[in-house]
């Protein structure tokens, strides 16, 4: 939907170019002004479908609210139009532009307001609460390892200066509700919980209000715990390799483990023509294992120099810890040197890789 030029602009129009992604424009308009917000595509590239959002809710076009892909126009602005506006990619919901808009009683001077977190009661401008730093509220889900600290922020302003209160799962949340208590910083509009535990999981809502209105934001906290497990080996490693006779080869194995892992490199061998023993266990020879001066990083790489046909075969990275073992295998194919391949071709022979 494009913005028609035939739309009449009531009051003064102040069009504002969009900020760089991740930054935020803080704007003040006078009551009755036309608020125009512009969000050009980042890097001048194609924009794709976008959606304009105010205080977390998609804006519905109307006679007063004109929504376009790169521009938003709000005619005859009033207090209720104060708030946090963003232009987002429709599919990904990625924020392209942020604006903090404040509509005051006085006609605007055209100057932008300094970006301060705290609002003062000036006695002149009155208005409902609005988010001053929506970019500091982007992370709606916090996944925090147990024993660390979490901080929820809801930086806001309004006149009179709004109050802030906190809910957990929809109910009033106070310090006595958790062991270790909570720390509130009203000036920073923040709630801090130290050394989080699984019982701290839940939805946390800040409620910011004054006599002109109320806004709220909900965050979800997940507290992550360690569950002991055997080593995890990165998928796709080691990878199958094809090498020319006499060349060097490296196999890689990436190991993730809480408990200290023990890493070994094994080569599968045949004994009396058999690859496995009577109990089904493969026959292997240990090529590399932990030594006094071997680091885990060194053990994650197996280097084969000047490979021969005998080096062809199956290789296994085996990692174990106190909980169990994991292993991944890969194959090495050794091809003849190029001169031999040329001679073979001339002789009419074909080598299968």
């Amino acid at each position: 939907e494009s913005l028609g030029t035939e739309q009449r602009v009531v009051g003064r129009a102040a069009e504002v170019p969009g900020p760089e992604p991740g930054q935020q424009e803080q704007l003040v308009f006078g009551s009755g002004d036309a608020v125009e917000l512009s969000c050009p595509p980042p890097g001048g590239g194609p924009m794709g479908p976008t959606v304009w959002v105010k205080d977390g809710t998609g804006l519905v076009p109307s006679e007063r609210v004109l929504v376009g892909p790169q521009r938003l126009q709000v005619l005859n602005a009033s207090h209720e139009d104060s708030g946090a506006y963003s232009c987002r990619q429709r599919l990904t919901q990625r924020v392209l532009c942020h604006f903090s808009v404040r509509v005051t009683d006085a006609p605007s001077s055209g100057d932008d307001e300094d970006g301060e977190d705290e609002a003062e009661d000036t006695g002149v401008d009155t208005g409902a609460p609005y988010w001053t730093r929506p970019e500091r509220m982007d992370k709606k889900l916090l996944a925090v390892p147990a024993a660390n600290t979490v901080r929820f922020r809801c930086p806001a302003a309004g006149n009179p200066t709004p109050s802030i209160s906190w809910l957990k799962n929809g109910r009033e949340f106070r310090g006595e509700h958790r062991i270790g208590g909570i720390k509130l910083r009203h000036q920073q509009w923040s709630l801090v919980m130290e050394s989080v535990v699984p019982s701290d999981r839940g939805n946390y809502t800040c409620v910011v209000e004054n006599k002109f209105g109320s806004i709220r934001q909900t965050y979800t906290l997940d507290v992550l715990e360690r569950s002991p497990h055997r080593p995890i080996l990165q998928a796709g490693l080691p990878a199958n390799q094809t090498a020319v006779l006499g060349s060097d080869v490296e196999f890689h194995c990436k190991v993730y483990s809480d408990a200290q892992p023990h890493i070994q490199w094994l080569k599968h061998v045949e004994v009396n023509g058999s690859k496995v023993g009577p109990d089904g266990t493969p026959y292997v020879t240990v090529l590399k294992t932990a030594g006094a001066n071997t680091t885990d990083k060194e053990l994650e790489v197996l280097s084969l120099h000047n490979v021969t046909f005998e080096d062809a075969g199956e290789y296994t990275c085996l990692a174990g810890n106190s909980i169990g073992f994991s292993h991944h295998s890969a194959w090495l194919v050794v091809l003849p040197a190029e001169e031999e391949l040329v001679e073979a071709d001339e002789a009419g022979s074909v080598y299968a890789g």
């Epitope: 970019e135 500091r136 509220m137 982007d138 992370k139 709606k140 916090l142 925090v144 390892p145 147990a146 024993a147 660390n148 600290t149 979490v150 901080r151 929820f152 922020r153 910083r185 920073q188 801090v192 050394s195 965050y219 992550l224 360690r226 993730y256 809480d258």
Partner: antibody
Framework: EVQLVESGGGLVQPGGSLRLSCAAS????????ISWVRQAPGKGLEWVGR????????NYADSVKGRFTISADTSKNTAYLQMNSLRAEDTAVYYC????????????????????WGQGTLVTVSS | DIQMTQSPSSLSASVGDRVTITCRAS??????LAWYKQKPGKAPKLLIY???FLYSGVPSRFSGSGSGTDFTLTISSLQPEDFATYYC?????????FGQGTKVEIK
């Protein structure tokens, strides 16, 4: 009670190597981290690097990147600072510090706080 | 790197005095700032984190304030055990960086 004990310091020649250990106790090692900070004689504090046990990640100061490696044995609750290609300017008291994260709805960063420190171990690089 | 500049580099004060140390960051570090106290031959001790949060066990005469680039550590009534060197440190940028320190001496 949280405790951190460094060891492994000493006199080493320029170009040499040394491995410092930091034995930790009294906190959930695998959920938090260990930072290394050094202090040259009569000078201020310099952050060397950090091991974050949750994901095993490491970060280093530019002055030591490529020469120093931080690792840990979580089964022993011990962190290590492997120092290679040592220079005279690496002479300092090396401290390890328990480090926890402040996870924030402001997605720009995680703040890292070093709240418990070891007693320090002196590393002297001299010929 | 983010540069942290403390002022003054040193100051002389008496027991009972109110002491203020400032720390300025070369770029915005939000509230990601800590203050440490260090006595000669000892390890640093955390006083304040996140610019204004008093660390547990630290006396309430210590307080921190500020955000963005300008921060302050205030000791409301200096005690004999407070004579030491104080460092600010930011951890929003990589690498974490310390101020050069402020030495608080007895007048």
């Amino acid at each position: 009670e949280v405790q951190l004990v460094e060891s492994g310091g000493g006199l080493v020649q320029p170009g040499g190597s040394l491995r410092l250990s930091c034995a930790a106790s009294g906190f959930p090692f695998t959920s938090q981290g260990i930072s290394w900070v050094r202090q040259a004689p009569g000078k201020g504090l310099e952050w060397v690097g950090r091991y974050w046990a949750w994901d095993g990640s490491t970060n280093y100061a530019d002055s030591v990147k490529g020469r120093f490696t931080i690792s840990a044995d979580t089964s022993k609750n011990t962190a290590y600072l492997q120092m290679n290609s040592l220079r005279a300017e690496d002479t300092a008291v090396y401290y390890c510090a328990r480090t926890y994260g402040i996870y924030d709805t402001y997605d720009k960063y995680t703040e890292y706080v070093m709240d418990y420190w070891g007693q320090g171990t002196l590393v002297t690089v001299s010929s | 790197d983010i540069q942290m500049t403390q002022s003054p580099s040193s100051l002389s004060a008496s027991v009972g005095d109110r002491v203020t140390i400032t720390c300025r960051a070369s770029q915005d570090v939000d509230t990601s700032l800590a203050w440490y106290k260090q006595k000669p031959g000892k390890a640093p001790k955390l006083l304040i984190y996140s610019a204004s949060f008093l660390y547990s066990g630290v006396p309430s005469r210590f307080s921190g304030s500020g955000s963005g680039t300008d921060f302050t550590l205030t000791i409301s009534s200096l005690q004999p055990e407070d004579f030491a060197t104080y460092y600010c440190q930011q951890s929003t940028g990589h690498p974490q960086t310390f101020g050069q320190g402020t030495k608080v001496e007895i007048k």
